[in-house]
């Protein structure tokens, strides 16, 4: 399964789309900036089996997909870019699912890294809570967009390390 190569390209396309989605100057949103506590340590470990690593990446993409699939998101972002972004994420999710099955065998259940997946879930809960507290304001969404761009960039480094390990 050559997921890291294909996923890296998909990640790059997703990053480009995220960059294009910006609709408000971040310089007007400095008062709203926030530290969401990206779970860096979950993307630092070399202890992962490939299937486990993919399951953590899958969770991050899934949570991002969920976040940008809400009606509040639809009301914020330019529709055609949002659709392209969602399609890109969906393709990545499908690729990952196929890859995990290939890695562990159809009959086996992949050993999920429960703690890492929980850390990613909590990270996105913090993002959702922030948006709620800020009443889904344009600046709040801009801050979240910047955060997701950074988390994608950091996961890209993780994927590249995964590829080197192979």
């Amino acid at each position: 399964c050559d997921l890291p190569q294909t996923h890296s390209l998909g990640n790059r396309r997703a990053l480009i789309l995220l960059a294009q989605m910006g609709r408000i100057s971040p310089f007007s949103c400095l008062k709203d900036r926030h530290d969401f506590g990206f779970p860096q340590e979950e993307f630092d470990g070399n202890q992962f089996q490939k299937a486990q690593a993919i399951s953590v990446l899958h969770e991050m993409i899934q949570q991002t997909f969920n976040l940008f699939s809400t009606k509040d998101s639809s009301a914020t972002w330019e529709q055609s870019l949002l659709e392209k972004f969602s399609t890109e994420l969906n393709q990545q999710l499908n690729d990952m699912e196929a890859c995990v099955i290939q890695e562990v065998g159809v009959e086996e259940t992949p050993l999920m890294n429960v703690d890492s997946i929980l850390a990613v879930k909590k990270y996105f809960q913090r993002i959702t809570l922030y948006l709620t507290e800020k009443k889904y304001s344009p600046c709040a969404w801009e801050v979240v967009r910047a955060e997701i761009m950074r988390s994608f960039s950091l996961s890209k480094i993780f994927q590249e390390r995964l590829r080197r390990k192979e």
Epitope: A19, S25, F27, R33, H34, V143, E147, S153
Partner: antibody
């Protein structure tokens, strides 16, 4: 290895124009915000302008607003500073700098700097 | 604009001993998100500035742990635990809390 190679500095008369360039390599240029910072003859650092990674948004302090324009060409991995209506107080060493990826906390730390290019405004 | 104030020179220090450089801002740099947007840069003679510290107390990549920084939100101190000859240069504090971003005038580290 991250590199920012600068060019375009020169001696120019008051009221004149100049365009500075900063060629980036060793990183995904289109993913990073960039700034220009100048160092005056008395060695003070003076932040001049900033541009977002995609180039859609810019900001300038009042001292250069309306006279300086920051831009970028992500296809060419190059940052620019167009300076017009130059004054003697614009005389400085101009540095381009890359901003660290800040995410939602918008950390605009300048983690890499070019070697600088000298601009002298004098009649 | 936020004004960053620094002394022009540090107290002269002996190699191997500790040094402190101070900086004061005209407004608290502590954001409601808990981050203090204070930065330290070092410019060695004949070189471009380099990032030392970000968000008041975090060491930038490749910076030796002899460097540390602390502060209250308005008053900040950069400490060098064992000064080496290569630490000579001008130290600038800067703020990224508000636009326009501003720098201190720089403090030159003096060696005895």
């Amino acid at each position: 290895e991250v590199q920012l190679q600068q060019s375009g500095g020169d001696l120019v008369k008051p009221g004149g124009s100049l365009k500075l360039s900063c060629a980036a390599s060793g990183f995904t240029f289109s993913s990073y915000g960039m700034s220009w910072v100048r160092q005056t003859p008395d060695k003070r650092l003076d932040w001049v302008s900033i541009i977002t990674s995609g180039g859609s948004y810019t900001y300038y302090p009042d001292s250069v607003k309306g006279r300086f324009t920051i831009s970028r060409d992500n296809a060419k991995n190059t940052l620019y500073l167009q300076m017009s209506s130059l004054k003697s107080e614009d005389t400085a060493m101009y540095y381009c700098a890359r901003h660290a990826e800040g995410g939602g906390n918008y950390d605009y730390a300048m983690d890499y700097w070019g070697q600088g290019t000298s601009v002298t405004v004098s009649s | 604009d936020i004004v960053m104030t620094q002394a022009a020179f540090s107290n002269p220090v002996t190699l191997g001993t500790s040094a402190s450089i101070s900086c004061r801002s005209s407004k608290s740099l502590l954001h409601s998100n808990g981050i203090t947007y204070l930065y330290w840069y070092l410019q060695k003679p004949g070189q471009s500035p380099q990032l030392l510290i970000y968000q008041m107390s975090n060491l930038a990549s490749g910076v030796p742990d002899r460097f540390s920084s602390s502060g209250s939100g308005i008053d900040f101190t950069l400490r060098i635990s064992r000064v080496e000859a290569e630490d000579v240069g001008a130290y600038y504090c800067a703020q990224n809390l508000e636009l326009p971003f501003t720098f201190g005038s720089g403090t030159k580290l003096e060696i005895k």
